[in-house]
Interface confidence: low
Amino acid sequence: GASSAGLGPVVRCEPCDARALAQCAPPPAVCAELVREPGCGCCLTCALSEGQPCGIYTERCGSGLRCQPSPDEARPLQALLDGRGLCVNASAVSRLRAYLLPAPPAPGNASESEEDRSAGSVESPSVSSTHRVSDPKFHPLHSKIIIIKKGHAKDSQRYKVDYESQSTDTQNFSSESKRETEYGPCRREMEDTLNHLKFLNVLSPRGVHIPNCDKKGFYKKKQCRPSKGRKRGFCWCVDKYGQPLPGYTTKGKEDVHCYSMQSK
């Protein structure tokens, strides 16, 4: 498709061959808008409308909408993994983001591709924000937004893990790594984790621990494993460099409180 083959690491999906297409059921009769199914799906389905819950594994939001975690969400990527985002008006999100987070000048900006703007796209922000396959969402935790973008190459589909800054410049891992010294160890672990997703057959990071970072890239004091269904993941406390602090853990029954730590 419109994505270029050389950008960043990719998680390859199975090609949409005749066998896959044979499983497709056309969308329901009353569809305001058709979008491709989430993940590596090959079929069409109805887009979600404004205000509907959404996430990485749900149907995609419709044109002009983005899947956005709640602004006060402590772990926005987990919220999106769990389908706890909401389809919100994209322009409203952009205005809010521009108002609250003026983008710092970034070297080597590349203009956003058409595919990145296409309707029905799915971006999943990782510790910071999120909506074929597209636009960045605002979340005040990070100066960069990590998105997992769905693209197409010939007859196969793939997921690209790119960085998108508030100013909507798109950069891949190699260009980002040149500036990694600007970020703390948590940010680098997060990048490594996302990088490893490319080895998965399908993009299904449930169970992959993506660290909870502050805006400078250091570890937030409270870290948690992903939830499994209704079972809450256990949490623990760390210092700003990610070293566990003894005596602060929970197996999910009760919440853990991490007091008087350097990194919030």
Epitope: A2, L21, A22, P27, A29, C43, S63, E114, E115, A119
Partner: antibody, heavy 119, light 110 residues
């Protein structure tokens, strides 16, 4: 070999109806849609509508709403396009085309059916 | 649904490149990457040449390429050959679950 074979040419009087058939073979009929496209003499392609061969859902071009009906018979893997209240400007070659839900394109075409509306 | 806008004609000599544009709106070309291009020789059915803006079906020469910027899609044919002389139509999926074609461009190989 995937193919769509359409019914033969028709000559109709104004006000009459025409029903064009399109028989699919070489692929799973219900896994794709069928689009209908027409082309008046010396003119460009005009998209008429599409039908889901899986559940019969239809979407028609606004211009033809109320005059066109698309159906699909899964037992024979055949799609039909029925156009009513024919006018002289409906004279055209009518094509059916397989609509792929993967690539949003019409990737296999029938040979065309000439419909002439004349008194 | 208005037809997408294409130039009525285009021409080029063998070996040259020619680009055909297709302009729509944010509800069709600009809103989706579901733009396709079709080639039609006189008296024949159309043939899919490009889908999803820039993908070629198997069997289509790599001389054919597609791109998109904003509300305008483009088909480029490089290394023109005599058999490329035909009518070319763009098509786009629209926000109302329908498709729309361009008016067509007659390509002449000089």
């Amino acid at each position: 070999q995937m193919q769509l074979v359409q019914s033969g040419a028709e000559v109709k009087m104004p006000g009459a109806s025409v029903k064009v058939s399109c028989k699919a073979s070489g692929y799973t009929f219900t896994s794709y849609g069928i689009s209908w496209v027409r082309q008046a003499p010396g003119q460009g392609l005009e998209w008429m509508g599409w039908i889901s061969a899986y559940n019969g859902n239809t979407y028609y071009a606004q211009k033809l709403q109320g005059r066109v009906t698309m159906t699909a018979d899964t037992s024979t893997s055949t799609a039909y396009m029925d156009l009513r209240s024919l006018r002289s400007d409906d004279t055209a070659v009518y094509y059916c085309a397989r609509l792929s839900y993967y690539n949003y394109a019409m990737d296999v075409w029938g040979q065309g059916t000439t419909v002439t509306v004349s008194s | 649904q208005s037809a997408l806008t294409q130039p009525p004609s285009a021409s080029g000599s063998p070996g040259q490149s020619v680009t055909i544009s297709c302009t729509g709106t944010s509800s069709d070309v600009g809103g989706y990457n579901h733009v396709s291009w079709y080639q039609q020789h006189p008296g024949k059915a159309p043939k899919l040449m490009i889908y999803e803006v820039s993908n070629r079906p198997s069997g289509v020469p790599n001389r054919f390429s597609g791109s998109k910027s904003g509300n305008t899609a483009s088909l480029t044919i490089s290394g023109l050959q005599a058999e490329d002389e035909a009518d070319y139509y763009c098509s786009s999926y629209t926000s109302s679950n329908t498709w729309v074609f361009g008016g067509g461009t007659k390509l002449t190989v000089l």
